[in-house]
């Protein structure tokens, strides 16, 4: 068993979250990731569900009784999801702590975006393809 | 020539981004694209760097001074990122949206913590693979 | 000041065993990935073998996979090498080295000073 | 597995420059941190530099690391060469299964 199973059922005790009630009014994550079966396009969905994780884990950083269960997850969470690769995750991060009133970053993504946008579609790597090719894709 | 293009000039000039002192002490997102080749790791990272533009149009939504450029490029990014698939566009910003200080909402984000684990490796969907294996993956 | 401190090595014949040991101190053992490392006499580092901060993932190279097992007991600080079916070519000086972080081994930042085992008849 | 690939040795004067190549054969080099040690004889390696060009306390500034996407390759570069940089450099990645050293490179001051 991974070693985060028993963590996390620690946690659920800690937020009172093993109850059946928990599961009222539907799920947020677990019925958005079972629409998506493209590797791509689920990479966009953990994308958000763990840089959700990493700010939920760090909100909770001071409580101790707590510490070890949130670094052995986070442990399996950079294992699972970045491959262990550091560089990986210090780019993702750099990415989720950019402050958006930051007046200085603003124009920095203004200044950007025009390439930004040009490399979103896959498309963007390969040569350039008809938007109107692009309309329907799934 | 995308419609993007003369909508993001127009950006430009209101963020007074045009000038080369903006590019000053690094990129924000540039760099880190330049360092992943990989689609699902480009589509890790466009992620955050798409809902960091959709929170920033958000920010200046009741300027009506750059209101057509915004929607202009929302479109684009819709066609581009997403596909021009609403059900995406949606689910991501479901997520986007989840306040990870309510107290509901972290509940929930507790109870799906150990499913949503068990997904995040691409090995997650076709069968168990040692997690020895992962150690060093890219 | 983190010290690593490696133990265990010796003259051993072809087909035995070995278990090194490595103290570690001066940091939070369990918070960070530990690897084991050789150099064969006169020659460059081989990595060997990594295991992550809470001991859940664990990595081997080719050449020592199915022989070789590390572990760690971060109840007292240690990481552990047991070597089985040693060869000649597993000769070496073998360090153990402390990661920057708890999830990758591929970030080495501190190294003991080494113990030499020698496979041999 | 990829394979990373340095010069076996370079020499140079004291006060001058040099700077020593890491190839890597397959995988993007900028998707992975790389790291250089130094060896001297009899001693255990120590990091000289970590996550590309990144600097341990207590290391002089004329040591600097950097890296190419366009020949996938990393330097590691000393300026103002002291006696006491003599000794054996490696390179150091990783990729998908496995921590991957250069073969190192033997710095002769001379």
């Known amino acids: 068993q991974d070693p985060y199973v028993k963590e996390a059922e620690n946690l659920k005790k800690y937020f009172n979250a093993g109850h059946s009630d928990v599961a009222d009014n539907g799920t947020l994550f677990l019925g958005i990731l079972k629409n998506w079966k493209e590797e791509s396009d689920r990479k966009i969905m953990q994308s958000q569900i763990v840089s959700f994780y990493f700010k939920l884990f760090k909100n909770f950083k001071d409580d101790q009784s707590i510490q070890k269960s949130v670094e052995t997850i986070k442990e399996d969470m950079n294992v699972k999801f970045f491959n262990s690769n550091k560089k990986k995750r210090d780019d993702f991060e750099k990415l989720t702590n950019y402050s958006v009133t930051d007046l200085n970053v603003q124009r920095k993504a203004i200044h950007e975006l025009i390439q930004v946008m040009a490399e979103l579609s896959p498309a963007a790597k390969t040569g350039k393809r008809k938007r109107s090719q692009m309309l329907f894709r799934g | 020539q995308d419609p993007y293009v003369k909508e993001a000039e127009n950006l430009k000039k209101y963020f007074n981004a045009g000038h080369s002192d903006v590019a000053d002490n690094g990129t924000l997102f540039l760099g880190i694209l330049k360092n992943w080749k990989e689609e699902s790791d480009r589509k890790i990272m466009q992620s955050q760097i798409v809902s960091f533009y959709f929170k920033l149009f958000k920010n200046f939504k009741d300027d009506q001074s750059i209101q057509k450029s915004v929607e202009t490029i929302k479109e684009d990014m819709n066609v581009k990122f997403f596909n021009s698939n609403k059900k995406k566009r949606d689910d991501f910003e479901k997520l986007t949206n989840y306040s990870v200080t309510d107290l509901n909402v972290q509940r929930k984000a507790i109870h799906e913590l150990i499913q949503v684990m068990a997904e995040l490796s691409p090995a997650a969907k076709t069968g168990k693979r040692k997690r020895s294996q992962m150690l060093f993956r890219g | 000041e983190v010290q690593l401190v490696e133990s265990g090595g010796g003259l051993v014949q072809p087909g035995g065993s070995l278990r090194l040991s490595c103290a570690a101190s001066g940091f939070t053992f369990s918070s960070y990935a530990m690897s084991w490392v050789r150099q064969a006499p006169g020659k460059g580092l081989e990595w060997v073998s990594a295991i992550s901060g809470s001991g859940g993932s664990t990595y081997y190279a080719d050449s020592v996979k199915g022989r070789f097992t590390i572990s760690r007991d971060n109840s007292k600080n240690t990481l552990y090498l047991q070597m089985n079916s040693l060869r000649a070519e597993d000769t070496a000086v073998y360090y153990c080295?402390?990661?920057?972080?708890?999830?990758?081994?591929?970030?080495?930042?501190?190294w003991g000073q080494g113990t030499l085992v020698t496979v041999s008849s | 597995n990829f394979m990373l690939t340095q010069p076996h040795s370079v020499s140079e004067s004291p006060g001058k420059t040099v700077t020593i190549s890491c190839t890597r054969s397959s995988g993007s080099i900028a998707s992975y941190y790389v790291q250089w040690y130094q060896q001297r004889p009899g001693s255990s390696p120590t990091t000289v530099i970590y996550?590309?060009?990144?600097?341990p306390s207590g290391v002089p500034d004329r040591f600097s690391g950097s890296i190419d996407s366009a020949s996938n390759s990393a330097s590691l570069t000393i300026s103002g060469l002291q006696t006491e940089d003599e000794a054996d450099y490696y390179c150091?990645?990783?990729?998908?299964?496995?921590?991957?050293f250069g073969g190192g490179t033997k710095l002769t001051v001379l």
């Open positions: 996550e590309d060009d990144q600097r």
């Open positions: 080295a402390k990661d920057r972080v708890g999830y990758s081994s591929s970030l080495l930042d501190y």
């Open positions: 150091q990645s990783y990729d998908r299964n496995s921590l991957v």
